[in-house]
């Protein structure tokens, strides 16, 4: 297969990651789903220099990350262990918090205003974030 | 001018498989995610599959989902579906279409002539 | 699975205005697409993103989307406007279209 050696169009470099950021809201699912058909994924936050960067273009906004735990566990989207790595969460959460009255708990994770993590119902239309990363070779099913 | 091509429709027997392809001109054919459709004689149009323009990511219709397969090659400018296990509710016209940008915010906005599959005994 | 459900059939007058509609839980929250095929031709994308035009769709083809319904609005109806017209929209990872509404001309 082929490497990535820039960015697309309208997407950000850092760190040899490529960015897209929003400016439309959509649910959790629909927003991987996007990142997946850019053959991206959803951001994965592995460090305080890669929050700091995400948080400076998104701004005050509620953005989804590539997190969640809709099958259990905490994960992230693109197998990085969550156990062992970088976490911003605010205080006291995650809280599955059942009291909005939606059905269910809260299941994904997203970026606050203030940058740091929440989790909230998976439906709800928020911004998002996607990203690939450069130099590493496209995942071309082999042809049949 | 920007144009899709299909070829390597026909007859099957049910149970047997068949590969088609859609060779893409005239636009930059990796950065465009792609799809099958198909129409049943005399019905509407139903989605079959679509591909991500770096072939990493695919979905599946649920009809098809497991006897499908939709790939491509960048370097060939190509789209293929391999068809197993055909039934005769598969018996169609198949168009290859082209996105005009990513699949969740945006249509189809260019289609083959469409290659016409019959699956009978 | 998510249904995307259309008038069978829609009859309008020549120089009148045809309006389609297209339902579907939340549609609004979703983008709407519009086709049209006619008789023995590959389907063309009239209406994307539930209201832009692809370049060489006339002035005439309009699309809104609110609530569970889009609407394709074609004006001044001709002749060769006489074809089925498909919505489609994304949800839950699947392409999904109506059933094809047939436009015929009187």
């Known amino acids: 297969g082929s490497e990535r050696t820039c960015c697309p169009v309208n997407w950000v470099e850092h760190e040899r990651s490529c960015y897209w950021f929003s400016r439309s809201g959509k649910a959790w699912a629909d927003a991987d789903n996007y990142c997946r058909l850019e053959d991206a994924h959803l951001v994965v936050v592995t460090s305080w220099e890669e929050q700091k960067f995400v948080q400076h273009h998104i701004g005050p906004v509620n953005t989804w990350m590539g997190l969640h735990d809709q099958n259990g566990p905490w994960k992230w989207v693109d197998g990085t262990d969550y156990e062992t790595g970088f976490k911003n969460w605010r205080p006291e959460q995650p809280d599955d918090w059942y009291g909005h009255g939606l059905g269910g708990g809260e299941d994904c994770a997203h970026f606050t205003d203030d940058g740091r993590w929440n989790d909230d119902v998976c439906q709800r239309p928020y911004r998002w974030v996607c990203e690939t990363e450069l130099d590493k070779a496209s995942q071309e099913p082999p042809l049949l | 001018e920007v144009q899709l091509l299909e070829s390597g429709g026909g007859l099957v027997q049910p149970g047997g498989s068949l590969r088609f392809s859609c060779a893409a001109s005239?636009?930059?054919?990796?950065?465009?995610?792609m799809s099958w459709v198909r129409q049943a004689p005399g019905k509407g149009l139903e989605w079959v599959s679509v591909?991500?323009?770096?072939?990493?990511?695919?979905y599946y219709a649920d009809s098809v989902k497991g006897r499908f397969t939709i790939s491509r090659d960048n370097s060939k400018n190509t789209l293929y579906l391999q068809m197993n296990s055909l039934r005769a509710e598969d018996t169609a016209v198949y168009y290859c279409?082209?996105?005009?940008?990513?699949?969740?915010?945006?249509?189809?906005?260019?289609w083959g002539q469409g290659t016409t599959v019959t699956v009978s005994s | 699975s998510y249904e995307l459900t259309q008038p069978p059939s829609v009859s309008v007058s020549p120089g009148q205005t045809a309006s389609i509609t297209c339902s579907g839980d939340?549609?609004?929250?979703?983008?709407a697409s519009w086709y049209q095929q006619k008789p023995g031709q590959s389907p063309v994308l009239v209406i994307y993103?539930?209201?832009k035009r692809p370049s060489g769709i006339p002035e005439r083809f309009s699309g809104s989307n609110s609530g569970n319904t889009a609407t394709l609005t074609i004006g001044g109806i001709q002749a060769m406007d006489e074809a089925d017209y498909y919505c489609?929209?994304?949800?839950?990872?699947?392409?999904?279209f109506g059933g094809g509404t047939k436009l015929t001309v009187l």
């Open positions: 279409a082209k996105w005009r940008g990513n699949p969740t915010d945006y249509g189809m906005d260019v």
């Open positions: 005239g636009f930059t054919f990796s950065s465009h995610a």
């Open positions: 591909i991500s323009g770096g072939g990493s990511s695919t």
């Open positions: 939340k549609l609004g929250d979703k983008y």
């Open positions: 993103q539930d209201n």
């Open positions: 489609q929209a994304w949800d839950s990872s699947t392409v999904v």
